[in-house]
């Protein structure tokens, strides 16, 4: 058998092969050795016992999207059926005092890889060690530590695999300099030792995206917008666009990015070499924004035409460093993945490539309450002998929209900690003048904020306001 | 005896550079991812990337906007962590930790200030 | 990327006592998860990985639980030299692997 057919249910076509190469992979023409690592098929009976007390799951994710040129990262997690936990040793053991299917256990091994009679089997040079062995049959890596991996990943996509030893934890990483830009698939095999063979113990796969565009999100805040999530904002008050570019590896680290941008008002285009950028509408209704962002990536010369001279490359920016490289990540506190592969190295030569990103949105803009200010506080008198309340009344004027509801709250001098919290429906006149009166529970300094709102916007004041004690001849103080 | 070495306290003025290290001794320093973490005064701990010593691959966080390249040296062990572009939210104390996914053995922090 | 949520905040504790510190993650981890001690000035130290396995050399006054979501590290008999800082950190999927905010254990 060969790893094709162990492994691959989505067949690869070989001219595709060609190109899309791993470096440090191997072609998944490979012969399995079926001996050491016996092959069933799906819904064989023996999947079913190749866990003690339950299946494990493998979890496969990866930070895809991936531009063409940067690297992708793959991890895989595996999660043990219930009571049932790694060691320190790597050894899978039952958690004491935990009850599942079989009652509370105790804490005894479900599986004790690295203690007794298997000790031999782990020397270097003798023949009790020719089944520490890849399904490729190369030899396990033999860095410190190393006899604590129990369980071997098979990685497979692209008509390629890649084998690493770990723990309930192992990570690759791939550089996507030569692929080709489309979804493509990542399958997970894991297999555990199973005396002096392994078993199969979870498959899993998932669907990664390679991108010849740079994968662009936006984010939009507002000052007063109530909700951030609707894409409704207010009129007269500026938005924030923050541009996030999902570059885990850096790959655009050191590539000048510049931003190109059309609000759908009529105001042109803005560019920028910015990431954030305020833009403020000044009518209401609704608006098509576009941005695209530009830059240029590290990528193959084009061949130079007999007919035509080579085009003049782009200066060279200077490469990342350390040069893009292929990780082979690590299972939980293993190494890194021993003697792992190289990524694809840059070629020497300097010519670049453009690369665009787009991201489109329809925002509402809407009026709403722009701004709210304190014009007056005042003492409220009372009767003698005096209450141990104090009455305040505050005068609370606003910009904009009409506000529809008015909440106080009372808290203490850092404004952390809210000790009342009063919110009404509000009638304001044509002037948005409003007033508001509070009680004060005794003497000492208090923070107050004032929020008005509507259906689209909140806007809030504080004040810091000083209650005096009773001496008739302590002013009222308030400080903005 | 598994030890991260990191280089001394930083000063360094707004819009500066600076370059931090981790020598890594007492374990085969390829073997191991080395992590960065900073945790400003009184905050809790930020993760900023990591870097895999045999080759050289980096994995970044890109929730956080500092702008670090990590790179290491096999021949001595050392880790380097350079910033570019700091600011005065860039204050705080960085430090070098080992393995993926979490962390083992860290180093004893470099404090870094950015000031005008 | 994953949220953790850590409470409380702060705790006051005599020696000798027990104390829980839970840790919330915005979404499902299952048991990838790692508890950290940080004492004033010095560095993290690794105390549970995989939610309730003890690093080497960690008293099992220390344990962790917990799965998916919800999480908690349990200090039986506060020692003196158990008070400083606790961290949650998630170690699930590709990075970055996100820390809580902090739990400051003080003596009482």
């Known amino acids: 058998k060969r790893f094709r057919d162990v492994l691959g249910h989505e067949q690869y076509p070989d001219h595709m092969r060609e190109h899309n190469q791993l470096r440090g992979w191997s072609s998944d023409e490979n012969e399995w050795d079926e001996h050491l690592y016996p092959v069933w098929r799906r819904g064989d009976g023996r999947w079913k016992d190749s866990w003690e007390g339950g299946r494990v799951q493998a979890v496969l994710t990866s930070d895809s999207p991936a531009l063409v040129g940067s690297n992708i990262t793959f991890v895989v997690n595996l999660v043990f059926p219930r009571c049932q936990k790694e060691d320190a040793n790597g050894n899978i053991v039952y958690e004491k005092n935990c009850r599942n299917d079989l009652g509370l256990t105790s804490d005894l091994h479900v599986y004790n890889w690295t203690a007794g009679a298997d000790d031999g089997d782990w020397e270097d040079g003798t023949s009790r060690s020719q089944h520490l062995r890849f399904p490729d049959r190369r030899p396990f890596p033999r860095p410190h530590g190393w006899k604590k991996w129990s369980f071997v990943y098979v990685f497979h996509t692209l008509g390629q695999y890649f084998q690493k030893l770990g723990r309930c934890s192992a990570r690759v990483s791939i550089n996507t300099v030569n692929l080709t830009a489309g979804p493509q698939v990542m399958e997970v095999t894991v297999f555990r030792r199973y005396g002096r063979a392994y078993i199969p113990i979870s498959k899993v796969k998932d669907v990664y995206v390679i991108t010849d565009q740079i994968p662009v999100f936006v984010t939009m805040s507002q000052k007063n917008d109530r909700n951030l999530s609707d894409e409704i904002f207010l009129r007269d008050l500026p938005i924030v666009f923050d541009v996030l570019i999902h570059d885990p590896s850096h790959f655009l680290n050191d590539s000048a990015i510049s931003y190109k941008w059309n609000f759908g008002d009529n105001t042109g285009l803005f560019v920028s070499n910015n990431h954030t950028l305020n833009h403020t509408y000044v009518l209401n209704g609704t608006f098509n924004l576009n941005l695209t962002v530009q830059t240029a990536v590290p990528g193959p010369c084009p061949p130079p035409s007999p007919s035509t001279p080579p085009p003049p490359s782009t200066p060279p920016s200077p490469p990342p460093s350390p040069l893009p490289t292929l990780s082979t990540p690590s299972p939980s506190l293993m190494p890194t993945g021993y003697k792992s592969m190289e990524l694809s190295d840059i070629s020497n030569e300097n010519c670049r490539i453009n690369r665009y990103g787009y991201f489109r949105a329809t925002i509402t803009i809407v009026e709403g309450i722009l701004e709210v200010s304190i014009m007056q506080i005042a003492d409220v008198p009372m009767p003698t002998p005096q209450p141990a309340n104090s009455l305040m009344d505050f005068t609370v004027t606003c910009k904009g929209a009409t506000p529809m509801e008015a909440c106080t709250i009372i808290s203490d001098p850092t404004c952390q900690i809210a000790q009342n919290r009063v919110c009404s429906p509000v009638a304001v006149d044509g002037l948005c003048l409003l007033s508001v009166r509070r009680a004060f529970n005794g003497s000492g300094t208090y923070c107050v904020n004032f929020t008005l709102g509507d259906d689209a916007s909140l806007a809030l004041t504080s004040t810091l306001i000083s209650i005096p004690g009773k001496d008739p001849d302590s002013p009222l103080r308030a400080v903005n | 005896e598994v030890q991260l070495q990191q280089s001394g306290p930083e000063l360094v003025k707004p819009g500066a550079s600076v370059k931090i290290s981790c020598k890594a001794s007492g374990y085969t320093f390829t073997d191991y991812y080395m992590n960065w973490v900073r945790q400003s005064h009184g905050k809790s701990l930020e993760w900023i990337g990591d870097?895999?010593?045999?080759?050289?691959?980096?994995t970044y966080n890109q929730k956080i906007k500092v702008k670090a390249t990590l790179t290491v040296d096999k021949s001595s062990s050392t880790a380097y962590m350079e910033l570019r572009s700091l600011t005065s939210e860039d204050s705080a104390v960085y430090y070098c930790a080992r393995n993926w996914p979490y962390f083992d053995y860290w180093g004893q922090g470099t404090t870094l200030t950015v000031s005008s | 990327d994953i949220q953790m949520t850590q409470s409380p905040a702060s705790l006051s504790a005599s020696v000798g006592e027990t104390v829980t510190i839970t840790c919330r993650a915005s979404?499902?981890?299952?048991?990838?998860l790692v508890w950290y001690q940080q004492k004033q000035g010095k560095s993290p130290q690794l105390l549970v990985y995989?939610?309730?396995t003890l690093a080497e050399g960690v008293p099992s006054r220390f344990s962790g639980s917990g799965s998916g979501t919800q999480f908690s590290l349990k200090i039986s008999s506060l020692q003196p030299e158990d008070f400083g800082s606790y961290y949650c950190q998630h170690h699930f999927g590709t990075p970055p692997y996100t820390f809580g905010g902090g739990t400051k254990l003080e003596i009482k």
């Open positions: 870097i895999n010593p045999y080759h050289g691959g980096s």
């Open positions: 979404e499902n981890i299952y048991s990838f």
């Open positions: 995989n939610a309730k």
